[in-house]
Interface confidence: low
């Protein structure tokens, strides 16, 4: 004969556990129903009556099957440097993420606690590592034969144009200026080479290299806002 299906509340067999979406109530010593997401336990079960659930109030939620007496409060409204990517509902917390041009300097379980603007690399420096949702831009000095003339969190160092006749040689922050009317744009096809090896880059002393990596977030946060890294600008 098939085993009888027990209805909550019921006393579990010794050594067994309650079924899915049930919990063991220590006071009643019974397996009782959990409340569904979006609800909470208004009245706990007894030996003769099951859990009474009620809907979460406004600005509160429960995301999981539960038997909590009160719903959790949704997080505070998103700050000006954030966008709300998930609204507060009875079943889910509000999630705030950083708006474009910012990254999450301090995350929380879901979303971001503290956003910070992406570093901008100043002229003479290019982006060596793009910013992500959770990490800042890393700037690097432009290697010989390359330049960046912008203050940007996205621009990388670009090759100087190759001139038939050079009017003004290029440097790390400026493209070469040609006297001829038809410069060969950035390294003639078939003559492209990788950047010079690291050993020769050290001869390229202008601009002064910045640290190759941004300080870790753990360094930054306790000390408050940090000055921009060399080769970068805070704005």
């Amino acid at each position: 004969l098939p085993a009888q299906v027990a209805f909550t509340p019921y006393a579990p067999e010794p050594g067994s556990t309650c079924r899915l979406r049930e919990y063991y109530d220590q006071t009643a010593q019974m397996c009782c129903s959990k409340c569904s997401p979006g609800q909470h336990a208004k009245v706990f079960c007894t030996k003769t009556s099951d859990t009474v659930c009620d809907s979460c109030e406004d600005s509160t939620y429960t995301q999981l099957w539960n038997w909590v007496p009160e719903c959790l409060s949704c997080g505070s409204r998103c700050s000006s440097d954030q966008v709300e990517t998930q609204a507060c509902t009875r079943e889910q917390n509000r999630i705030c993420t950083c708006r474009p041009g910012w990254y999450c300097a301090l995350s929380k379980q879901e979303g971001c606690r503290l956003c910070a603007p992406l570093r901008k690399c100043r002229p003479g420096f290019g982006v060596a590592r793009p910013g992500t949702e959770t990490s800042d831009v890393v700037c690097k000095p432009c290697a010989p034969g390359t330049f960046s003339n912008t203050t940007s969190s996205t621009d990388i160092c670009r090759p100087h144009q190759i001139c038939n006749v050079v009017a003004i040689p290029g440097n790390a922050s400026m493209d070469a200026v040609c006297t001829s009317t038809s410069p060969t744009r950035s390294m003639a096809p078939g003559a492209v080479h990788l950047p010079q090896p690291v050993s020769t880059r050290s001869q390229h002393t202008q601009p002064t290299p910045e640290p190759s990596t941004a300080p870790s977030t753990s360094f930054l946060l306790p000390m408050g806002p940090s000055p921009p890294a060399e080769g970068s600008t805070g704005d």
Epitope: P130, V138, I156
Partner: antibody
Amino acid sequence: EVQLQESGPGLVAPSQSLSITCTVSGFSLTSYGVHWVRQPPGKGLEWLVVIWSDGGTTYNSALKSRLSISKDNSKSQVFLKMNSLQTDDTAMYYCARHDDDGYYAMDYWGQGTTVTVSS
Amino acid sequence: DIVLTQSPSLMSASPGEKVTMTCSASSSVGYMYWYQQKPRSSPKPWIYLTSNLASGVPARFSGSGSGTSYSLTISSMEVEDAATYYCQQWSSDPFTFGSGTKLEIK
């Protein structure tokens, strides 16, 4: 001469984890980052993760919960671990060097290691 | 995520023919990178910073574009150019690849 060489188990059972090693030579992991990219049979390339020269990491958010990357600079090795493999994780897994000056995202690639997920 | 859409997915060209393939980004990217891959081989960097040829790439290749629209052109197709070409961006993570354009010889 710059070289990257992947090594892995070849065959992995579903729900099990995968560990692959990329051994590099001709450059230092303290100066260059290393990416992992995979390619399912007959399909395109999918970027997975990079470990940068300073040890920082950037993950493909769609796979982040299943991926872990680390490295041993002294042994010139980068390690990729992937959990809970399914049959659609069957692919050629490549490691590739990141050119830190931003010329190429990936300027040298390994030959790849074939990973088959099957029971 | 930035989605890169390559077209056509498959094309064939005769030797000497001009070939153009495109890569369209779902949002603006600063530069495009291209890789060439032949069967049973690893991808090779082919074009970087949108328009610069990697070492050893023949001068018949060129790249162009900006914003969301990029292209790779071969001025005169040769047998050795038959391969799959992938575009790739690293303006924002994940550093996505296009689905590839397979170029066959007629």
